[in-house]
């Protein structure tokens, strides 16, 4: 299966809104998407969110911080191909995120 293509849709100081897409023929085989994310530089702990939709908002994040985000399709056969590992950054408190 083709891996999900992931986009950053929006961000705040404490959240990241992420969406993804896969080719329509594959969508019927997917029952959930698993979103794994963690702070950049912190390889010991990560968070997992599961959703049936094509987007998620990751909340309670730290300001001006980069997070590694990956989306994986879950099918009846098991895990599909994972997306690229993306780096998304929350806004700084001043709102001047680069």
């Amino acid at each position: 299966t083709e891996p999900p293509k992931v986009r950053l849709e929006g961000r705040s100081t404490t959240s990241l809104s992420v969406s993804w897409s896969i080719p329509p023929p594959q969508q019927s085989r997917v029952w959930k998407y698993e979103v794994t994310y963690r702070k950049k530089g912190d390889s010991n702990s990560y968070n997992v969110r599961r959703t049936e939709g094509f987007s998620v908002t990751l909340d309670d994040l730290a300001p001006d911080t980069t997070y590694l985000v990956q989306v994986q399709a879950l099918t009846q056969e098991g895990q599909g191909a994972g997306s690229k590992v993306h780096e998304f950054q929350t806004l700084s408190p001043e709102g001047s995120g680069n």
Epitope: K40, G82, K84, H86, F88, Q89, L91, G97, N98
Partner: antibody
Framework: QVQLQQWGAGLLKPSETLSLTCAVY????????WSWIRQPPGKGLEWIGE??????????NYNPSLKSRVTISVDPSKNQFSLKLTSVTAADTAVYYC?????????????????????WGQGTMVTVAS | SYVLTQPPSVSVAPGQTARITCGGN??????VHWYQQKPGQAPVLVVY???DRPSGIPEQFSGSNSGNTATLTISRVEAGDEADYYC???????????FGGGTKLTVLG
């Protein structure tokens, strides 16, 4: 179009300190993570480390195999960054390159660690011999 | 630390297609970049983000990446393509940049 020009001593004795500087012409200096890469004669490429200067803070990241001996610093007023490698041995003999990543490190919240290098310095051959 | 494995050498006849592989654990989740280096010169970026070409790089250079292998494909190979080729990724687990060992492409004849 960004250009990189590098210079520094080409012949060192063992235990001395290697010192190279790379000047950046054009482009936005603070938007990028600037890297040093080396290539021993007849061998492959080895990433040494990178530096970014944002605000008044330097962000450094070094290859673990060289970390104890490497310092990469910046002079933002001159758009220059420098490499220092202490206690050199013959194994440090190589062509040393400075390099610029293809994209600014972060743009609208999307970041590119370890981006491709689209512009390279001309290379400096450094020989360590007694 | 993350390791990228390339074949030391690949040989191909002029006009044929050369495929150079870069192996790494779950490399499909990473963006792979490819460089061409000719003797005495600095490396030149020929493919980035698995399959994108910088401006000025001909269409004969293409790339793909899936599972544990990324591939640089050079179609209609000519003598001027003889060079060393290197793959590169960012290892997000260690936050370090890694190069493959390089592949020497020889154009026969």
């Amino acid at each position: 179009q960004v250009q990189l020009q590098q210079w520094g001593a080409g012949l060192l004795k063992p235990s001395e300190t290697l010192s190279l500087t790379c000047a950046v012409y054009g482009g936005s200096f603070s938007d990028y993570y600037w890297s040093w890469i080396r290539q021993p004669p007849g061998k492959g490429l080895e990433w040494i480390g990178e530096v970014n200067h944002r605000g008044s803070i330097n962000y450094n990241n070094y290859n673990p195999s060289l970390k104890s001996r490497v310092t990469i610093s910046v002079d933002p007023s001159k758009n220059q960054f420098s490499l220092k490698l202490t206690s050199v041995t013959a194994a440090d003999t190589a062509v040393y390159y400075c390099a610029k990543p293809l994209r600014p490190h972060c743009t609208n919240g999307v970041c590119y660690s370890g981006d491709a290098f689209d512009i390279w310095g001309q290379g400096t051959m450094v020989t360590v011999a007694s | 630390s993350y390791v990228l494995t390339q074949p030391p050498s690949v040989s191909v006849a002029p006009g044929q297609t050369a495929r150079i592989t870069c192996g790494g654990n779950n490399i499909g989740s990473k963006n792979v970049h490819w460089y061409q280096q000719k003797p005495g010169q600095a490396p030149v970026l020929v493919v980035y983000d698995d399959s994108d070409r910088p401006s000025g790089i001909p269409e004969q250079f293409s790339g793909s990446n899936s599972g544990n292998t990324a591939t640089l494909t050079i179609s209609r190979v000519e003598a001027g393509d003889e060079a060393d080729y290197y793959c590169q990724v960012w290892d997000s687990s260690s936050d370090h940049l890694v190069f493959g060992g390089g592949t020497k492409l020889t154009v026969l004849g």
